[in-house]
């Protein structure tokens, strides 16, 4: 699908929001305001935010969004259907699963509706673009007097996801990290019994399905040691 | 203010190959979207290709699989590898570029780049 630049009817007033670029044509150019920067974030593949700075606008200014993807089946141009407000002007659109092709070139346009030469038409990998949610279930085992393993699980396809553990004993002052692969499992092979251990974990969605940069948030952090339950010392999903 | 500058155009055969480079002065492009764009006589400047500043590349649809968009951030340049040139390829090719915020904006409008260059002409003949 060809981008096509709409042509203003002749009625703007052209001396409002106007200034000079060095654009390569045989007369000097002149070209409008720049539009804000759309950034897109693609949350467990369940549903996108784009969203722009509304407030970087000269007026207070309803701008829409059209998208289409490139070479694809789903190159129609489509309307933002679910547009995200901040102080009753348009921030941003939501769009849901079914709308979303993480593997096909996603084409972005936001436009000022009373001044149509002002538009500007971004490109995004959405595949690079996903957020997982937080892992969630976080568990301990005890593998031996002195190993422990965290398990934990995520709401998405797990070999898509690498994952950052930090844990630390209450009497560090900084955390301790590891990378760990899609294999969403753990072990700290020497324990130290008389102190407390906290336990914490993000994901991203990098590198076999994608390569985000944005990790999730934090899952809750869970603990194990000297203050922990005594019945079971062998198994312990405590959340703080 | 980024000056742009581009080289490396000249006339080729068709199925031939050329490398545009367009040489940045004044700032690093390092946080800068960047584009490139062609002219032929008597048409619409369109979009050829355009990157991020993070590293993703894009393509217009008659140039995807023949043309390379690539950057040196330390040179300050960016580049087109253009391969299988074909006449309808003859034309003024432009190296654009914009300050972005974000390291996954890539414009492939040309009226959101604020910086161009002079041009460099290509010629493909059969």
């Known amino acids: 699908l060809n981008t096509t630049i709409l042509t203003p009817n002749g009625n703007e007033d052209t001396t409002a929001d106007f200034f000079l670029t060095t654009m390569p044509t045989d007369s000097l150019s002149v070209s409008t305001l720049p539009l804000p920067e759309v950034q897109c974030f693609v949350f467990n593949v369940e549903y996108m935010n784009c969203t722009w700075n509304s407030s970087s606008e000269p007026q207070p200014t309803n701008l829409t969004l059209h998208y289409w993807y490139k070479n694809s089946d789903n190159d129609k141009v489509q309307k933002c259907s679910h547009y995200l407000f901040s102080e009753e002007i348009t921030s941003g659109c939501q769009l849901q699963k079914k709308e979303i092709h993480l593997y096909q070139t996603f084409v972005v346009q936001l436009q000022d509706p009373r001044e149509p030469r002002r538009q500007a038409t971004q490109m995004l990998k959405l595949q690079n673009l996903v957020i997982p949610w937080a892992p969630e279930n976080l568990t301990l085992h005890k593998l031996s007097e002195s190993q422990l393993e965290l398990n934990w699980n995520n709401r998405f396809l797990n070999h898509c996801l690498e994952h950052l553990v930090q844990y630390r004993t209450d009497w560090d002052h900084s955390w301790t990290e590891q990378s760990v692969d899609y294999r969403h499992k753990f072990s700290l092979p020497s324990v130290d019994g008389q102190k407390r251990y906290t336990f914490r974990v993000r994901s991203r969605f990098n590198p076999l399905c994608g390569s985000a940069q944005h990790w999730s948030e934090w899952s809750h952090p869970i603990h194990w040691g000297s203050n922990t339950s005594k019945e079971n010392p062998f198994l312990f999903a405590l959340e703080a | 203010q980024v000056q742009l500058q581009e080289s490396g155009g000249g006339l080729v055969q068709a199925g031939g190959s050329l490398r545009l480079s367009c040489a940045a002065s004044?700032?690093?492009?390092?946080?800068?979207?960047m584009g490139w764009f062609r002219q032929a006589p008597g048409k619409e400047r369109e979009f050829v290709a355009c990157?991020?500043?993070?590293?993703?590349?894009f393509y217009a649809d008659s140039v995807e699989g023949r043309f390379t968009f690539s950057r040196d951030n330390a040179k300050n340049a960016t580049y087109l590898q253009m391969n299988s040139l074909q006449p309808e390829d003859t034309a003024v090719y432009y190296c654009?570029?914009?300050?972005?915020?974000?390291?996954?904006?890539?414009?492939?409008?040309?009226?959101?780049?604020?910086?161009w260059g002079q041009g460099t002409q290509v010629t493909v003949s059969l």
């Open positions: 654009a570029g914009a300050p972005t915020s974000f390291a996954t904006t890539a414009y492939s409008s040309s009226n959101s780049y604020t910086v």
């Open positions: 990157d991020s500043w993070g590293g993703d590349t």
């Open positions: 004044g700032r690093t492009l390092s946080r800068y979207a």
